[in-house]
Interface confidence: low
């Protein structure tokens, strides 16, 4: 962008520039290329030798510019077209400038010479005109632009030196170049004056537009000597909740029903299914009533809900064990992280309230977090009613105020073999016999018909065991070796069959010596 400091064509009255000597440059009304009347300066003292004619503009304020450009429109008479012209005829003139802090020039100051004036250049015509051209009003107007700098004072004067030409200075425009205020890469760069040299690059620091933030390096844009912005460094991007519109010059809040979770170039996106925004500029969408977002769910994922209950439960009871199978819920809640929990309630033999099952119940593969729709449950009590709830849960179950949906199944366990005998003790012993007694199993699961006792010598293998039956919970085992250790195990039998053997118990018969001693102790004194 060019900012004009002075333009001679806009003058409505005399320009009134200073000339030296008075016989040199002359202000006359002339015409521009469009035949508009303008104020011009002419000089044509070609027949007089040693010409040194100066023309000085009025004081021109710099207005912060560092480099000044001067556009001159002029026409120069072709020396060869002037009859009997002396060799001193020139087709060029010189351009000078002089810096000052205020308008201090007089008729004699600054001196009319190259020092103190600073020469910018010798200006030559690209085309000169001949007498014929003038007569036909065809003017060959030259346009030349020269620049100088750096300038640092408040202002300056320009001077044009003629040294023997025939020319007309038609227009003089003085300007500087600046880069305009611009919004680029999401940043505002304020109007910046070009540098002091033609090759200067002036760095302008940008500030992010409203609702944008810096992404990378300091936001910089360079203004070149021609008043053009070069490629920017760094950028700003609309922050979360805002999107770029109007060619990236505005960060607009996401319209209602849309959101943007992160800073970046991307546009706002529609709220995922089952969510909505409550205002403009949303960084996330709020789930509708009854729908939730798990902690690790991305913000662009639909809101989901809890699953419905499992369906079509099938139970298969075998004595005190149970296989449960079911089909998945009709509605998974829109999620893929569905698992099942099993809640076991024991209802005794059918009367009274149910209670949570004890820790002795076994679940395979596990009670909670089942991924497959089946479970094997064992170690239940015989002849007992149970209620099993199969809960369907997913990643948002914890967020819901409602309990998980479940399917319920009631079962009753069958007759089962008795549990193991837990305690066995020795009543008496001799060199070849041991009398044992034991308590009834904790869970007889019916009427005990009899017991089976298995025993073998500790030094021998279990394969050598002998089994004997006893209708009561006491038995005397005969025919044993003196002083030997025997291993004993007992199990109970009901109509449902044998229970598990008890743990191994070790008892020893008397040695001969012990037996003799015990007899002596029993003899009367």
């Amino acid at each position: 962008v060019e900012e004009t400091l002075m333009d001679s064509t806009t003058a409505t009255a005399e320009l009134g520039w200073m000339v030296h000597p008075p016989s040199g440059w002359e202000e006359v009304s002339g015409y521009d290329e469009n035949m508009n009347t303008i104020r011009t300066y002419q000089v044509c003292n070609v027949f007089e030798s040693s010409q040194n004619n100066w023309l000085r503009t009025k004081f021109i304020r710099r207005r912060g510019a560092h480099r000044i450009h001067v556009e001159m429109k002029f026409s120069v008479r072709d020396c060869s077209s002037i009859p009997s012209v002396p060799g001193s005829c020139k087709e060029t003139f010189n351009l000078y400038y002089y810096e000052a802090d205020f308008d201090l020039a007089t008729k004699t100051f600054p001196n009319w010479m190259e020092n103190p004036w600073v020469k910018v250049d010798t200006i030559a015509a690209d085309e000169s005109f001949s007498q014929v051209d003038l007569g036909g009003r065809v003017m060959k107007i030259n346009t030349e632009v020269r620049s100088f700098g750096p300038v640092s004072r408040n202002g300056f004067y320009l001077a044009f030196q003629d040294y023997g030409g025939c020319m007309s200075l038609i227009a003089v425009r003085v300007f500087y170049r600046k880069c305009p205020r611009i919004i680029q890469n999401g940043a505002i760069f304020q109007e910046t004056l070009s540098g002091a040299e033609s090759t200067s690059l002036v760095a302008a620091r940008g500030s992010c537009i409203a609702n944008a933030e810096e992404v990378d390096v300091p936001i910089k844009l360079y203004c070149n000597g021609d008043g053009e912005w070069l490629v920017p460094i760094g950028r700003c991007m609309c922050k979360a909740g805002f999107e770029a519109v109007e060619n990236g010059t505005v960060c607009r809040g996401c319209p209602s029903g849309t959101f943007k979770a992160n800073q970046g170039d991307e546009a706002c996106t529609h709220c995922p299914i089952n969510s909505r925004t409550t205002s403009e500029g949303a960084t996330n969408c709020v789930c509708r009533n009854g729908y939730y977002r798990a902690d690790l769910d991305p913000l662009d994922m639909p809101c989901t809900t809890i699953p419905s209950a499992p369906q079509a439960v099938i139970s298969s009871v075998n004595e005190t064990s149970l296989m449960l199978e079911w089909t998945p819920p009709r509605d998974s809640g829109g999620r893929e992280d569905l698992v099942y929990n099993i809640i076991c309630k024991s209802c005794g033999s059918g009367r009274g309230a149910c209670t949570r099952c004890g820790d002795n119940v076994q679940y395979a593969p596990r009670q909670l977090g089942l991924t497959e729709p089946r479970i094997y449950i064992s170690d239940l009590l015989a002849h007992t009613q149970y209620t099993f709830e199969i809960q369907a849960v997913n990643g948002v179950t914890d967020q819901s105020p409602f309990s998980p949906q479940f399917a319920s199944v009631n079962i009753t366990t069958n007759q089962a073999a008795p549990s193991a005998v837990s305690i066995m003790h020795q009543v008496s012993r001799t060199v070849d016999s041991i009398t044992l007694s034991w308590s009834q199993p904790d869970q007889p699961n019916g009427v005990i018909l009899d017991y089976e006792l298995q025993y073998y010598e500790k030094e021998l293998s279990e394969y050598n065991a002998t089994a004997i039956k006893s209708p009561t919970n006491t038995v005397t085992v005969q025919g044993l070796k003196a002083g030997a250790i025997y291993v004993f195990q007992v199990r109970a039998r009901t109509v449902a069959g044998y229970g598990r053997y008890s743990g191994k118990m070790y008892f020893q018969t008397m040695t001969e010596a012990e037996y003799q001693t015990s007899i002596k102790e029993k003899l009367p004194l």
């Epitope: 940043a187 760095a203 940008g206 500030s207 992010c208 933030e213 810096e214 990378d216 390096v217």
Partner: antibody
Framework: QVQLQQSGAELAKPGASVKMSCKAS????????MHWVKQRPGQGLEWIGF???????TDYNQKFKDKATLTVKSSNTAYMQLSRLTSEDSAVYYC?????????????WGQGTTLTVSA | DIVMTQSPSSLSVSAGEKVTMNCKSS????????????LAWYQQKPGQPPKLLIY???TRESGVPDRFTGSGSGTDFTLTISSVQAEDLAVYYC?????????FGAGTKVEIK
Amino acid sequence: QVQLQQSGAELAKPGASVKMSCKASGYTFTSYWMHWVKQRPGQGLEWIGFINPSTGYTDYNQKFKDKATLTVKSSNTAYMQLSRLTSEDSAVYYCTRRLKLLRYAMDYWGQGTTLTVSA
Amino acid sequence: DIVMTQSPSSLSVSAGEKVTMNCKSSQSLLNSGNQENYLAWYQQKPGQPPKLLIYGASTRESGVPDRFTGSGSGTDFTLTISSVQAEDLAVYYCQNDHSYPFTFGAGTKVEIK
């Protein structure tokens, strides 16, 4: 907590080069620019330049453009190499971080690396 | 480059007194886009690295005692210590964070009588 741990003191001869390090911990290394500042004995602070660890982009004070070279390694470490050493380079050199967004200042500084250039 | 001029270069005060130091920049440090002044104040105690006290001309860094206050805009800035303590013995630097190259003032040395 945030820490910038700089390498130990260096003694170098005129004309030589040195490379000092600054290991960052306690924060996301790529979220902050790493700046370097020079302080001659009993003098003020001079900004050398910075590097953006996430892109490797550098910007230097023109005065140090031919003197300092800033680099980063993925191991949360920034480096500054000083070349063609003279006695004028004898100073304490600090690394300091500056947040990329919203916050305009250098909030944590290393303890400094002392460089002595002597024949 | 922006020149930062600090005054006074040093001052000596008694504990409990109010201390005011000034910082003048050769160009405005006000970012017209976000109306923030890109100026920071640092404290440097002997043998230690500088420590950030104030950023954005007036925002106190977390953990900095509230006796430290920054003010000013454009080219003129002030750091005030409302009631100086013995541990405030240090050199205080202002810093242009507006334009590259970043520049620091020459510092104001605070001595405790």
